[in-house]
């Protein structure tokens, strides 16, 4: 097999063999190498010399193959916008941010730019579990049968009703979606409001 051309090489149709790693330089009508992530163009290519790439200086980065003559400035995660850092900026990657706990992304422009507090889920409901934390606001769903949740909270989970018999007790009042089962000692008398039903 014939060896492929290595940049710089002439291109009459203004396209390059590897669009990701090469670019067309119209002045010389040649294809030149782009610079790899973490670097920038320190010397442009010519007909006899390929692009020279230098490493981005501290606190700057380039994430992709590029023919930029500068690196992008690293930006911190803005706590005022509800963001926190999960991975620092490097020469090859911008600072990785996410919404702070209890918040969701309210404004998205290629990445999250603004987070807001998650809505509370009322008693008897819980927030539907999402694939990615912080991606959207809470969608509250009712507790499934045999479970309860008794607060207004963005994060509280429905808990299973207590089983009185597991504790050697008997049920005094059944659990609901908003309250746990009430248990009592089997020897205790019924509360006054229930004594009528016992007489029956």
């Amino acid at each position: 097999s014939q060896p492929q051309a290595v940049p710089p090489y002439a291109s009459e149709n203004q396209t390059c063999r590897d669009q990701e790693k090469e670019y067309y330089e119209p002045q010389h009508r040649i294809c030149c190498s782009r610079c790899p992530p973490g670097t920038y163009v320190s010397a442009k290519c010519s007909r006899i010399r390929d692009t020279v790439c230098a490493t981005c200086a501290e606190n700057s980065y380039n994430e992709h193959w590029n023919y930029l003559t500068i690196c992008q400035l690293c930006r911190p995660c803005d706590p005022v916008m509800g963001l926190e850092e999960i991975a620092p900026c490097t020469s090859k990657r911008k600072t990785q941010c996410r919404c702070q706990p209890g918040m969701f992304c309210a404004a998205w422009a290629l990445e999250c730019t603004h987070c807001e507090l998650l809505s509370d889920c009322p008693p008897g409901t819980e927030a539907e579990l999402k694939d990615e934390v912080g991606k959207g606001n809470n969608h509250c769903v009712p507790c499934k049968a045999g479970h309860f949740q008794n607060t207004s909270s963005p994060s509280a989970r429905c808990q299973p009703h207590t089983r009185c018999e597991n504790q050697g007790l008997v049920e005094a009042a059944p659990g609901t979606a908003q309250s746990d089962t009430t248990c009592k000692n089997p020897l205790e008398p019924l509360p006054p409001e229930m004594s009528g039903t016992m007489l029956m």
């Epitope: 790899p36 230098a54 020469s91």
Partner: antibody, heavy 122, light 108 residues
Framework: QVQLVQSGAEVKKPGASVKVSCKAS????????MYWVRQAPGQGLEWMGW????????NYAKKFQGRVTMTRDTSISTAYMELSRLRSDDTAVYYC???????????????WGQGTLVTVFS | EIVLTQSPGTLSLSPGERATLSCRAS???????LAWYQQKLGQAPRLLMY???RRATGIPDRFSGSGSGTDFTLTISRLEPEDFAVYYC?????????FGGGTKVEIK
């Protein structure tokens, strides 16, 4: 602790291909670029290229373009380096190396595999 | 591509002596993006220094690095028996990264 464990020694005939594996553990595999460096017997170190395990993006040294392919399998935290159309001067120890994790640009190598000897002879 | 030339090729010294290893670049290495490695026979290289003068984790303070631009130096203040090995410099300031040819530090 960080470990890079490479596949065993290989003996190949000229014109054949070899595929060396490098299993990573002790860190997030997709978080750092993986590099391949080779060393011919009694010679110095030679950079071959890198792979971004997160995206699968690669960068090969010009000398190896068209002959080397770097891939990864994130499900088993393993990087691979395949070199084709082997010649006798490809006889070398092949190392995988993880880029550094401190300092700004991290294209120096803090952790290395134990090396895989590839011998090419007819 | 930046070519790194290491000198001397071999350095014969006794334990306790000071070792000075040189690494010269064919062009300026931006931001002192230079690393040093130690390699013993049959082993993988071990990172000693990065950023020209920053010691890697677990490296004893008898190892120090200096220099900028095109001239860099690795100094071992007092050679210990375990320091006899081959030392390589590597630049990562310009793509592609490159290694020097190595300096062997042997027992006199």
């Amino acid at each position: 602790q960080v470990q890079l464990v490479q596949s065993g020694a290989e003996v190949k005939k000229p014109g054949a291909s070899v595929k060396v594996s490098c299993k990573a553990s002790g860190y997030t595999f997709t978080g750092d670029y993986m590099y391949w460096v080779r060393q011919a017997p009694g010679q110095g170190l030679e950079w071959m290229g890198w792979i971004n395990p997160n995206s699968g993006g690669t960068n090969y040294a010009k000398k190896f373009q068209g002959r080397v392919t770097m891939t990864r399998d994130t499900s088993i935290s393993t990087a691979y380096m395949e070199l084709s159309r082997l010649r006798s001067d490809d006889t070398a120890v092949y190392y995988c190396a993880r880029e550094g994790s401190s300092g700004w640009s991290a294209e120096y190598f803090q952790h290395w595999g134990q090396g895989t000897l590839v011998t090419v002879f007819s | 591509e930046i070519v790194l030339t290491q000198s001397p090729g071999t350095l014969s010294l006794s334990p306790g002596e000071r070792a000075t290893l040189s690494c010269r670049a064919s062009q300026s290495v931006s931001s002192s993006f230079l690393a040093w490695y130690q390699q013993k026979l049959g082993q993988a290289p071990r990172l000693l220094m990065y950023g020209a003068s920053r010691r890697a984790t677990g490296i004893p303070d008898r190892f120090s690095g200096s220099g900028s631009g095109t001239d860099f130096t690795l100094t071992i203040s007092r050679l210990e028996p375990e320091d006899f090995a081959v030392y390589y410099c590597q630049q990562y300031g310009t793509s592609p990264l490159s290694f020097g040819g190595g300096t062997k530090v042997e027992i006199k």
